[in-house]
């Protein structure tokens, strides 16, 4: 951890590498002071998507994250964003380790390690820091695509990561185009995959206290279909009266089996977007349909709470496509003076 150059304030720590995910274990009651890079200007700290106030026990102040005395509820994900561009400068997870609050003099000092800040961190066997990014194990991708497998982990001492293919050490030397091992990102990247890349890819993460592993199964398809295509204008912006029934339509074209999700955009703690930049959504319906069918979302007896943005999300083994529409719900007495739908056109998006 590098020390800040700001001398007029109390020293603070800066996470090791910018734009790298990092996990820090903090003792209960310990003060935390973290810098957001080497400048104090134009940097804001967020916790779980909400910007930290500049005053209080936990505050984001002059580009610094300050916690007077670490409490269990302070654990979580913290982001430092550059104002304007909203670039993520630091992506940090703080974990609480209350074992540090009761260190007695007769403990074996080898079980603890200290950082340059003078804070003491316990040694810890490797663990997954973002298991939600490892939820999908079985992969099937078209030949020519780029494949990225990630096993984000942490531990103390900092663990090392090794990759195996079908149980054997894998360095990509026999692979045309080789591989990219990005140890800081705990990732393996293979570009332009071919059928000979099929297999089981295992990340082995280990330090002196233990090891963990996770396997991905990769199939390479010798064809190149496209992600789903959604018919323009569907779903359509709709205006309805309280108590009426509404149908939102989504017509999907896909040569690969499409899966459809209907999402409703929601607001959490006054925000429509999470710290990752993605909107907060509620999944209303998930279904598999046969190609070129119309998928319908039925909303019965709508109320004012049903108003808002709805998204039809279609995915297949190649990628995702989505389109959105707005539902306006009017009280019954308003029916006489407006029948217009909102001005905004449906949104059209395609994502790989």
């Amino acid at each position: 951890l590098e020390a800040s150059e700001e001398m007029e304030q109390e020293p603070c720590l800066a996470p090791i590498l910018e734009q790298q995910e990092q996990v820090l274990t903090v003792a209960l009651g310990q003060p935390v002071r973290l810098c957001c890079g080497r400048t104090e200007r134009g940097r804001h700290w967020y916790k779980e998507g909400s910007r930290l106030a500049s005053a209080g026990r936990v505050r984001g102040w002059r580009g610094r994250l300050e916690i007077a005395s670490f409490l269990p509820e302070d654990a979580g994900r913290y982001l430092c964003l550059a104002r304007g561009s909203m670039t993520v400068v630091h992506n940090l997870t703080l974990l609480m380790d209350d074992s540090l609050t009761s260190i007695s003099n007769d403990e074996d000092p080898k079980t603890l390690s200290s950082s340059s800040s003078g804070h003491v961190y316990p040694q810890q066997a490797p663990y997954w820091t973002h298991p939600q990014r490892m939820e999908k194990k079985l992969h099937a991708v078209p030949a020519g695509n780029t494949v990225k497998f990630r096993c984000p982990a942490a531990g103390n001492p900092m663990p090392t990561i090794h990759w195996l293919k079908d149980g054997q050490a894998f360095h990509g030397e026999n692979r045309i185009g080789g591989i990219r091992l990005r140890h800081q990102h705990w990732s393996l990247v293979m570009e332009s995959v071919v059928p000979s890349d099929r297999g089981t890819y295992t990340c082995l993460v280990e330090n002196s206290l233990g090891s963990i592993r996770y396997s991905y199964l990769l199939d390479v398809l010798e064809r190149s279909p496209h992600r789903p295509i959604l018919q323009a204008g569907l779903p359509a912006n709709t205006t309805a009266v309280v108590g009426s029934d509404v149908e939102l339509l989504c017509k999907v074209y896909s040569d690969a089996q499409p899966h459809i999700q209907w999402l409703k955009h929601v607001v959490i703690n006054g925000s429509s977007f999470g710290a990752d930049g993605f909107p907060y959504v509620q999944v209303l319906k998930t279904t598999d349909i046969n190609s070129s069918e119309v998928e319908v979302l039925y909303l019965r007896n709508v109320s004012a709470e049903d108003a808002g943005e709805y998204t039809c999300l279609a995915g297949n083994s190649i990628g995702l496509s989505y389109q959105s529409a707005w539902l306006t719900v009017l009280p019954e007495e308003d029916l006489t003076w407006t029948t217009a739908t909102p001005e905004a056109a449906s949104h059209h998006h395609h994502h790989h």
């Epitope: 999908k136 194990k137 996770y214 199939d219 690969a256 089996q257 083994s317």
Partner: antibody, heavy 120, light 112 residues
Framework: EVQLLESGGGLVQPGGSLRLSCAAS????????MGWVRQAPGKGLEWVSV????????IYADSVKGRFTISRDNSKNTLYLQMNSLRAEDTAVYYC?????????????WGQGTMVTVSS | QYELTQPPSASGTPGQRVTISCSGS????????VHWYQQLPGTAPKLLIY???QRPSGVPDRFSVSKSGSSASLAISGLQSEDEADYYC????????????FGTGTKVTVLG
């Protein structure tokens, strides 16, 4: 309607062979990982094998490795399990199942099963 | 054969809450998503719930799951007679090679 229909079960002597089939309908078979799961009479579920969409990647439980072969014919929407050197402990109902990425790689669709009895 | 351990049986009266535990290791539940299956008497298993309380359509929200470390549990609140079935947890396992493993199974009986 999404459906899986197994066939090919029956009575076979120890050391004998049998080939099970699973006909898929109602979904694009060639885009799914598929597997076999078995259940001995009065016992729990045991995973047997899985095959990738292209058929190019197969994985087996240790208990059947070297004796069973999973395969598929995407043009016929059919999954197969070739069982050789059968033993009494292979007696079970064999289920064909689909693994779905949207169900986080769980087996989301199952067939009704076909009974395999290994006995002399 | 079984890497995941479940209690053989659980029971409750209608309306009660029943919980089934599923114990594994770091190579299966500790690193992988847990799936739960329900098998009604004389029928094929069906996917009941997976991941972070995600359910196939038609599965009531009386069923919920939790996971901590290398263990998981399935809770059935407001037990109903139609919940009488065998329940299996399952997970992919990465110990030496990837494979899929089921729990030993739990028979849920609705009393009265």
């Amino acid at each position: 309607e999404v459906q899986l229909l197994e066939s090919g079960g029956g009575l076979v002597q120890p050391g004998g062979s049998l080939r099970l089939s699973c006909a898929a309908s109602g979904f694009t078979f060639s885009h799914y990982w598929m597997g076999w799961v078995r259940q001995a009479p009065g016992k729990g579920l045991e995973w047997v094998s899985v095959i990738s969409p292209s058929g190019g990647l197969t994985i087996y439980a240790d208990s059947v490795k070297g004796r069973f072969t999973i395969s598929r014919d995407n043009s016929k929407n059919t999954l197969y399990l070739q069982m050789n050197s059968l033993r009494a402990e292979d007696t079970a109902v064999y289920y064909c199942a689909r693994s779905s990425g949207w169900a986080l790689d769980a087996f989301d669709i199952w067939g009704q099963g076909t009974m395999v009895t290994v006995s002399s | 054969q079984y890497e995941l351990t479940q209690p053989p049986s659980a029971s409750g009266t209608p309306g009660q809450r029943v919980t089934i535990s599923c114990s594994g290791s770091s190579s299966n539940i500790g690193s992988n998503i847990v799936h739960w299956y329900q098998q009604l008497p004389g029928t094929a298993p069906k996917l009941l719930i997976y991941g972070n309380n995600q359910r196939p359509s038609g599965v009531p929200d009386r069923f919920s799951v939790s996971k901590s470390g290398s263990s998981a549990s399935l809770a059935i609140s407001g037990l109903q007679s139609e919940d009488e079935a065998d329940y299996y947890c399952a997970s992919w396992d990465d110990s030496l090679k990837a494979f899929y493993v089921f729990g030993t199974g739990t028979k849920v009986t609705v009393l009265g």
